[in-house]
């Protein structure tokens, strides 16, 4: 299963960030988004969005904190490899 592509983190504020990515139409049933403070491995927040979505606004972030975010495509119960990025609020 190919991973989503072109993960971009934009509009970063002290407590939010916009994620956007690309994928072929109907390539995935859904996407899994996983993010965490980079220093706190194992405390990830995981959420899903429908396969038709190509963006998501992360909210409730901590100011001045580095985050690692990964997105997985899901199709038929299978997960793609992750596409990842790092950003700081």
């Amino acid at each position: 299963l190919p991973a989503p592509k072109n993960l971009v983190v934009s509009e970063v504020t002290e407590d939010s960030a916009r994620l956007s990515w690309t994928a072929p139409d109907a390539a995935f049933d859904s996407f899994l988004i996983q993010y965490q403070e980079s220093e706190k491995v194992g405390e990830a927040i995981v959420l899903t969005v429908p396969g038709s979505e190509r963006s998501y606004d992360l909210t409730g972030l901590k100011p001045g904190t580095e985050y690692t975010v990964s997105i997985y495509g899901v199709k038929g119960g299978h997960r793609s490899n992750p596409l990842s990025a790092i950003f700081t609020t």
Partner: antibody, heavy 115, light 110 residues
């Protein structure tokens, strides 16, 4: 696609632990986020928490320590650790489709806490 | 925690008419808002997510709008079947918090 059915709701006395079970059909829990929501009689909806895996659980601040959410490959459980009369409500299990927005719900199970 | 305030508590409108329900967040939540319809004895039904995206199978008579802190659900061409309680929900969650629901608005169809 898919269905959810809650069970385990009953009359309990205050302080008696109670576990509710959500049995899942037609949903792959390994790639799904599930939630528990409750509704007291005549009141509004109240989110308790969400689970992806047994490591990835998220609780409302008021619910932390009072509830435990866990799952197997086919069920999602909600344990009420020490029920009080204020926990009397219908408890719903649901699938999250867009972050915490939930598109598939069970019919709910009624918990009554009374001495 | 983010507090969601819904107004009014109850609203009525004639068959074929339009009603509007408002939801205000205590802080900026961007577009992380959902709307539900619930009838007595039934679980909630998701109508709208991402503030304005219609859930699968939901009539286009339902329209969600807004972002930031102010959101609106508009129901046009009211039908008797629209009589229900409508609730908004902040849909984000994370470490130590879970998005909350508004108190609900009862829609009466005359």
């Amino acid at each position: 696609g898919g269905s959810l059915e809650e069970s385990g709701g009953r009359l309990v006395t205050p302080g008696t632990p109670l576990t509710l079970t959500c049995t899942v059909s037609g949903i792959d829990l390994s790639t799904s986020v599930m939630g528990w929501v409750r509704q007291a009689p005549g009141k509004g909806l109240e989110s308790i928490g969400f689970i992806y895996t047994n490591v990835n659980t998220y609780y409302a601040s008021w619910a932390k320590g009072r509830f435990t959410i866990s799952r197997t490959s086919t069920t999602v459980d909600l344990k009420i650790t020490s029920p009080t009369t204020g926990d009397t409500a219908t408890y719903f299990c649901a699938r999250a489709v867009y972050a915490g927005a939930m598109d598939l719900w069970g019919q709910g199970t009624l918990v009554t806490v009374s001495s | 925690d983010v507090v969601m305030t819904q107004t009014p508590a109850s609203v009525s409108g004639p068959v074929g008419g339009t009603v509007t329900i408002k939801c205000q967040a205590s802080e900026r939540i961007y577009s992380n808002l959902a709307w539900y319809q619930q009838k007595p004895g039934q679980p909630p039904k998701l109508l709208i997510y991402k503030a304005s995206t219609l859930a699968s199978g939901v009539s286009s008579r339902f329209k969600g709008s807004g972002s930031g802190t102010e959101f609106t659900l508009t129901i046009r061409d009211l039908e008797c079947a629209d009589a229900a309680t409508y609730s908004c929900q902040y849909t984000s969650y994370g470490s130590g918090y879970v998005g909350t629901f508004g108190g609900g608005t009862e829609v009466v169809v005359e």
